[in-house]
Interface confidence: medium
Amino acid sequence: LNTTILTPNGNEDTTADFFLTTMPTDSLSVSTLPLPEVQCFVFNVEYMNCTWNSSSEPQPTNLTLHYWYKNSDNDKVQKCSHYLFSEEITSGCQLQKKEIHLYQTFVVQLQDPREPRRQATQMLKLQNLVIPWAPENLTLHKLSESQLELNWNNRFLNHCLEHLVQYRTDWDHSWTEQSVDYRHKFSLPSVDGQKRYTFRVRSRFNPLCGSAQHWSEWSHPIHWGSNTSKENPFLFALEA
């Protein structure tokens, strides 16, 4: 048997490659219609949702999903055990933590049970599809008269994440942003004590453990300055 491992060419393209776009659907039988593309995201390596656009089908169809891992100990075909529904039609599958193997090629197959030959297979690198939870517990420490340090926590292995910090004052029209590596701390060397600052952070599973493109949600914002600075000049963790 061939033991090669399939690897996608870069990150998954999210364009609808599995929809027919070149000719009207009424000129083809259902059995030749391409199936919708499956998109999978691994949420904080706690569970994974694989979803598809069920409304792309010419008539309501409960498509079925099977999955396995290519060339591994987990290459036995598995049926989805927890379907997600949209208007009573299957539109996704949720896999639990024990079913997620980040560093093996994940193979997902969508099938029309009425037309068994109508099936499409996709291969995904799950380590590129991880979306961490938003950073938590933002705190600000005043390191000196004009220097602030922002710290936060993530509910995941810290060394696997990179971060994006955004901050602005009440006088600013746009955010200033700064990339931060796995150390999850950020220093602002020059702070104007007359202004009120707002900070927020998001995180991404990149580059040490994977090459994910999607960021987490933004953290709750934290504020510093003017109306708060007199209360405790050394520690602030005020959320909006």
């Epitope: 490659d17 599995f18 776009t21 070149t22 083809l28 391409p34 290519k70 297979t121 996709q122 291969m123």
Partner: nanobody, 123 residues
Framework: EVQLVESGGGLVQAGDSTTISCVAS????????FGWFRQAPGKEREFVAT????????YYSDSVEGRFTISKDNAKSTVYLQMNSLQPEDTAVYYC????????????????WGQGTLVTVSS
């Protein structure tokens, strides 16, 4: 029903590059996903690469990843396999295959096949 004709095979020196082509006729080219498979003498047919209907998603076996590139020209109804840094182990008959529903690495999932083109890599 789509017909597939491969071309471009031949004798190549190790380390060199070549491109093989697959012209499709008799079907709506843009509605098909395509795959390249190969079969070396005395071995089973093995997956090489696959490309989706619109050409935006492609996959490779780990033995050719980084050396081979699959592409698709809908205007010319042609699929290409560009092969760089060829090695003697790449010697095989290369087959083009088409299917309706999306990329797949299993030969049994493909509906239509070409006759193959022989690529020989000499050391």
């Amino acid at each position: 029903e789509v017909q597939l004709v491969e071309s471009g095979g031949g004798l190549v020196q190790a380390g060199d590059s070549t491109t093989i082509s697959c012209v499709a006729s008799g079907g709506s080219f843009a509605t098909y996903a395509f795959g390249w498979f190969r079969q070396a003498p005395g071995k089973e047919r093995e997956f090489v690469a696959t490309i989706s209907q619109r050409g935006s998603t492609s996959y490779y076996s780990d033995s050719v990843e980084g050396r081979f590139t699959i592409s698709k020209d809908n205007a010319k109804s042609t699929v290409y396999l560009q092969m760089n840094s060829l090695q003697p182990e790449d010697t095989a008959v290369y087959y083009c295959a088409a299917r309706y529903y999306g990329v797949d690495y299993r030969s049994t999932s493909y509906d239509f096949w070409g006759q193959g083109t022989l690529v020989t890599v000499s050391s």
